[in-house]
């Protein structure tokens, strides 16, 4: 018998064809994969299916964010009898199929990782031709992207009453700890806002009152490294009289 589950938007969620306990749809993905920004990652995905010796047309798909409805980041199609899955979509040219779908392997290589790639990915296979069937991983694999700190912005801004304040924003994973140093400061963890709303890898530290002229340095550090940047404050002191 065939059991098909449909969600409210009429997307086919999965189809389980029950012929024998050993022959049913399943997908094997690890819960999480970790890799460093700038490097490559492999998202493993293998599957079993009930259609023995299927060699008809197939499509392999990876999507990001959420299953069934998330945006596709990779898609390839293999013609009947072909071992070659021809890539039809590779977002930013960074997604490459490592596995052979004919051998039940949809594993994907992601190149030049960025912190924005840190999300969940879902593999899916679709059979067409004599057999029409499809299956998608429900839970997916979380890609955890780590990164050494990088200071993305450092600035001095005016404050009320002719005062000045300094802001330092850094990104990294784990989110970096920020410290300010400067004239009459020593080391200060002044007013860290961590992390910013909607920007999970960004951390901002504020120095609310710059009391002396000179160089102010922001240092960002996490387990993968450290980064620093400086701003200079020189106020114009006019002659009194």
């Amino acid at each position: 018998f065939v059991r098909t589950k449909i969600d409210t938007t009429e997307n086919l969620l999965n189809t389980e064809v029950h012929s024998s306990p050993a022959q049913r749809w399943s997908m094997q993905v690890p819960p999480e994969v970790s890799a460093e920004a700038g490097d490559a990652a492999v998202l493993p995905c293998t599957f079993t299916h009930p259609h023995r010796h299927y060699d008809g047309p197939l499509t392999a798909i990876w999507r990001a964010g959420e299953p069934y409805a998330g945006p596709q980041v990779f898609r390839c199609a293999a013609a009947r009898g072909s071992e070659l899955c021809q890539t039809a979509l590779s977002l930013h040219g960074r997604f490459r199929l490592l596995g052979n779908p004919r051998r039940n392997d949809l594993s994907l290589r992601v190149e030049r990782l960025a912190l924005a790639d840190d999300r969940r990915y879902f593999c899916r296979v679709e059979f067409a031709g004599d057999v029409h069937d499809r299956y998608e991983s429900r839970h997916g694999v979380r890609l955890h992207v780590t990164a050494a700190p990088r200071i993305v912005n450092i600035s001095v801004l005016p404050s009320p009453a002719h005062a000045f304040r300094a802001l330092c924003t850094a990104e990294g994973e784990p989110p970096p700890a920020l410290a300010w140093s400067g004239p009459a400061l020593g080391n200060s963890l002044a007013a860290v806002r961590s992390p910013r709303e909607g920007h999970g890898h960004l951390v901002t530290a504020e120095l609310p009152a710059l009391t002396h002229d000179g160089r102010y340095t922001c240092t960002a550090a996490n387990s993968l490294g450290r980064s620093e940047a400086s701003v200079y404050l020189f106020r114009f002191h006019g002659a009194s009289g």
């Epitope: 690890p30 994969v33 890799a35 490097d39 490559a40 990652a41 492999v42 998202l43 493993p44 070659l84 899955c85 021809q86 890539t87 039809a88 979509l89 590779s90 040219g93 490459r96 199929l97 490592l98 596995g99 594993s107 290589r109």
Partner: antibody, heavy 121, light 111 residues
Framework: EVQLVESGGGLVQPGGSLRLSCAAS????????MNWVRQAPGKGLEWVAQ??????????FYAASVKGRFTISRDNAKNSLYLQMNSLRAEDTAVYYC????????????WGQGTLVTVSS | DIVLTQSPDSLAVSLGERATINCRAS??????????IHWYQQKPGQPPKLLIY???NLASGIPARFSGSGSGTDFTLTISSLQAEDVATYYC?????????FGQGTKVEIK
């Protein structure tokens, strides 16, 4: 049957230029990444350059030893791969192989017979 | 760049005996169980031929006496029963990180 046939090799003086070609047949050229790999006389193999296909925006990659001097390109309509070599040096003397790789793997599943480039005065 | 070091540089093996070639990478070439090491055979005056891809997968048309194993930084190509036509130089290659690099080669001869 997959075939890769290189041409354009020869003797050139240091500082000179040469353009290598590779004619591909027996497969859908558009589906694959293409590479140049070289082998100096009596030495080992050195990957030189790669050009990806349309889906991968024809991205190009180069070995540090040739970057800025060599340019890889392809003409899908002609099923051809090219290597423009400028500012040639004695150490560029080698047999240059055209090699195919799948979009999913940077290994070389088919190779041409090679064309010899000799840089000498 | 990832440096691949093959050992030995040359190897003499009797016909029918086992030949083993090692390839060591200067850093890990394995990600999530996938090892980006490939093996080639090159006979004199010929281009290289792919034998094994991703550490252990036999390329199309290659006899089953060739096998590959390993992960991380250490990999092995084994010829289970050396034949006369296996006399050649063997190279490993990595595609873990660009630039793709090759080992220096191992020459296999008949003892």
């Amino acid at each position: 049957e997959v075939q890769l046939v290189e041409s354009g090799g020869g003797l050139v003086q240091p500082g000179g230029s040469l353009r290598l070609s590779c004619a591909a047949s027996g497969f859908n050229f558009n589906d694959y990444f293409m590479n140049w790999v070289r082998q100096a006389p009596g030495k080992g193999l050195e990957w030189v350059a790669q050009i990806r296909n349309k889906i991968y925006t024809y991205a190009t990659f180069y070995a540090a030893s040739v970057k800025g001097r060599f340019t890889i390109s392809r003409d899908n309509a002609k099923n051809s791969l090219y290597l423009q070599m400028n500012s040639l040096r004695a150490e560029d003397t080698a047999v240059y192989y055209c090699a195919r790789s799948l979009t999913g793997g940077d290994y070389f599943d088919y190779w041409g017979q090679g064309t010899l480039v000799t840089v000498s005065s | 760049d990832i440096v691949l070091t093959q050992s030995p540089d040359s190897l003499a093996v009797s016909l029918g005996e086992r030949a083993t070639i090692n390839c060591r990478a200067s850093q890990s070439v394995t990600i999530s169980g996938y090892s980006f090491i490939h093996w080639y055979q090159q006979k004199p005056g010929q281009p290289p031929k792919l034998l094994i891809y991703r550490a252990s997968n036999l390329a199309s048309g290659i006899p089953a006496r060739f096998s590959g194993s390993g992960s991380g930084t250490d990999f092995t190509l084994t010829i289970s029963s050396l034949q006369a036509e296996d006399v050649a130089t063997y190279y490993c290659q990595q595609s873990r990180k660009s630039p793709w690099t090759f080992g220096q080669g191992t020459k296999v001869e008949i003892k």
